[in-house]
């Protein structure tokens, strides 16, 4: 387990002509803030494939006012890290999406409105542990200035954050053939070797030499599959010739979280919600203040200038907990009404409605859509009598079952070519036209259709704006 | 695994035509690529010859080449080919086939395939 | 016809040399930016180093950096080592759906 961390240092206006104009207006106030999204391996999948590594919101940055007729600055941006924890190994090698929103904060009705102002993706190769990577990726006219690594959270280290520290046996020297853990030279590495034997689909170890099964396996081995409706009691012995899943001890069992933690179990482990002025895996870290930066997701540090008096973090819309390292599950309030699916974006709370059903929170019944689904998240639009599907991105036919090409509905106009490139479609134009998707023409003095935004874009530029 | 290999002649006499195909495996051009040919003499540099889009299936040739290169799609046997008419020796070359996903760059390649133009 | 012009052709460098090689296009790329850097050793096929000329392959060391735009632009070797000796071509794409190559640079190593 551990924390990936990307720094932003900054988001402005790119080397070279045609500087951008500022996003923000004295009419139309605005602010920055930030979304990355990880996933592993070189990923080919387009923009829209699930960030399978974790993704994270930033905190809102500064209202920002431009003044009229002004090129655009570098823009204030938001306080503290964006952090995407992972609970497996670090894969090494990940492709990441990072991009940068504008949020309006006129007049609008039902609140400010969001817009995507750039993103860039890219592939990198990076080991746990290791110093920060800085980095500066270009989006038409602006420019990003960033930093990121990826750490281990205690106990495990090394470059995929796959071994374990244990505290010395002898308290002078390590065992034969292991390492003091840095930087605690008082801790040992540990090598994880489960049971023999163990299976590695269905098992797994957090002590050496043990083998516990994941959910639905049992068995000494963890290579018997459960079978529920053989089993008499709901505890008892563990029988692992009828295979019946009889809970044993469980991870919480002994409490292992220090200093006051309450212990909750997980899938595959247990997870420890520490009391104020402690933190990590089992809260056994302590004597922290603001300096040490424990609010995390941009929460603010206040008080604890000493390890002996307490700091309260204050935590972000959509985080809570004591260091605010836990996302607020706001569709646990069930929003979503007629048994829509709600998915809490960060930034937004959306429902995906069930078929015969629309509306922010599928409040609306369309008749017309009654008993017909549509596949793969896709949505049911009434349409005068027949139901048409308005299926998610990356899918497409009648009912959504067809996996789609990205440039499959020929987003790119006036004949340009769309590429499915990892970080979206990306369109070529073709002679004459210009802008996202093509869509405008160029005059022949040179001058362009181009509307005021988006900003940065010259003739013959690239899809940028998603 | 993401894959292109090349095959076709070692061997083809002046003035014949030359057919190279490439096969894929890995991805589908379901989704919409250029696939392209480009070639190198020995000791010389890489020199485009043409992609085929597979959006649309049009195709666009560097100027020498036109009228002389053929490139086409076969999709259910996940292969693309090339024609080359009236060959001579400065034909002699490795060619390469390549894949582009956007952005301008191939950033998948074959391992190339030496063709010899002797009589 | 669009030209691709690199230069050097030839250069020779000690390990640790900061190297650079330019390629000039006598039209501007598509988007300003689209244009990659690859790198041949013998008998193998070119690999992609940099794409919209300043992006790093993954993969790539960090001491590969690309820059520029339009038509001029530059490749740079911070600290020269011993597998960097290959020939290094530039690449660029063009209004059209145009491909073109540079004629190429060898770098050895002294």
């Known amino acids: 387990a551990g924390v990936f961390e990307l720094q932003i240092h900054s988001f402005g206006p790119g080397p070279g002509p045609g500087a951008p104009r500022s996003p923000c207006s004295a009419r139309l106030p605005c602010r920055l803030f930030f979304r990355v999204c990880l996933k592993p391996g070189l990923s080919e999948e387009a923009a829209e494939s699930p960030c399978a590594l974790g993704a994270a919101l930033s905190a809102r940055g500064p209202v920002y006012t431009e003044q009229p007729g002004a090129p655009a600055p570098d823009l204030p941006l938001p306080d503290g890290l964006l952090q995407v924890p992972f609970r497996d190994a670090w894969p090494g090698t990940f492709s990441f999406i990072i991009e940068t929103w504008r949020e309006e904060l006129g007049d609008q009705i039902g609140g400010p409105a969001w817009s995507l102002l750039a993103r860039v993706a890219g592939r990198r190769r990076l080991a746990a542990g290791g110093p920060w990577a800085r980095d500066i990726q270009r989006a038409g006219a602006w420019e990003l200035r960033f930093s990121y690594r990826a750490r281990c959270e205690p106990p495990a280290v090394g470059t995929a954050c796959t071994r374990l520290c244990r505290p010395r046996s002898a308290p002078s020297r390590c065992g034969p053939g292991l390492r003091p853990c840095a930087p605690l030279e008082d801790e040992c590495e540990a090598p994880l070797v489960c049971r023999a034997g163990c299976s590695p689909e269905h098992g797994f170890c957090e002590q050496p030499g043990e083998c516990r099964c994941l959910e639905g396996w049992t068995g000494p081995l963890c290579t018997v599959p459960v079978s529920t409706s053989s089993c008499l009691s709901p505890r008892g012995p563990s029988s692992a010739t009828t295979g019946c899943l009889v809970p044993g001890p469980g991870p919480c069992d002994g409490n292992p979280c220090a200093n006051g933690g309450s212990c909750s179990e997980t899938p595959r482990s247990f997870e420890c919600t520490c009391p104020r002025g402690f933190y990590g895996l089992r809260c056994e870290v302590s004597g922290v203040t603001c300096a040490d930066g424990p609010c995390f997701n941009g929460g603010l540090c206040v008080g604890g200038a000493d390890p002996d008096s307490a700091y309260i973090c204050h935590c972000p819309p959509g985080f809570q907990g004591s260091n605010c390292e836990k996302r607020v599950d706001r569709c646990s309030l069930q929003p979503c009404r007629n048994g829509g699916l709600c998915l809490d974006l960060g930034h937004a709370l959306r429902c995906r409605c069930r078929a015969g059903f629309a509306g922010p929170r599928c409040e609306h019944d369309l008749d017309d859509c009654a008993g017909r689904a549509c596949a793969n998240g896709g949505t049911c639009v009434e349409g005068g009598g027949a139901h048409r599907c308005s299926c998610a991105l990356g899918f497409g036919g009648r009912d959504c079952r067809e996996r789609a090409d990205p440039c499959a509905a020929r987003p790119c106009a006036h004949g340009g070519r769309c590429y499915a490139h990892f970080s979206g479609l990306v369109c070529a134009c073709a002679p004459g036209y210009m802008g996202a998707r093509c869509e405008f023409p160029v005059h022949p003095d040179g001058a362009s259709a181009l509307p005021a935004a988006p900003p940065g874009l010259r003739p013959g530029d690239p899809q940028r704006y998603l | 695994q993401v894959t292109l290999r090349e095959s076709g002649p070692a061997l083809v006499k002046p003035t014949q035509t030359l057919t190279l195909t490439c096969t894929f495996s890995g991805f589908s051009l379901s989704s919409s690529y250029d696939m392209g040919w480009v070639r190198q003499a020995p000791g010389q540099g890489l020199e485009w010859m043409g992609t085929i889009y597979t959006g649309d299936y049009s195709t666009d040739y560097a100027s020498w080449a036109k009228g002389r290169v053929t490139i086409s799609v076969d999709t259910s046997k996940n292969q693309f080919s090339l024609k080359l008419s009236s060959v001579t020796a400065a034909d002699t070359a490795v060619y390469y086939c390549?894949?582009?996903?956007?952005?301008?760059?191939?950033?998948?390649w074959g391992q190339g395939t030496l063709v010899t133009v002797s009589s | 016809d669009i030209q691709l012009t690199q230069s050097p052709s030839f250069l020779s460098a000690s390990v640790g040399d900061r190297v650079t090689i330019t390629c000039q296009s006598t039209?501007?790329?598509?988007?300003?930016?689209?244009l990659s850097w690859y790198q041949q050793k013998p008998g193998q096929p070119p690999k992609l180093l940099i794409y919209?000329?300043?992006n790093l392959e993954i993969g790539v060391p960090s001491r590969f950096s690309g820059s520029g735009s339009g038509t001029d632009f530059t490749l740079t070797i911070n600290s020269l080592e011993a597998e960097d000796a290959a020939t290094y071509y530039c690449?660029?794409?063009?209004?059209?759906?145009?491909?073109?190559f540079g004629g190429g640079t060898k770098v050895e190593i002294k």
């Open positions: 690449q660029g794409y063009y209004s059209g759906y145009i491909y073109a």
């Open positions: 039209e501007s790329v598509y988007g300003s930016d689209w």
């Open positions: 390549a894949r582009h996903t956007g952005y301008g760059y191939f950033g998948l």
């Open positions: 919209q000329a300043s």
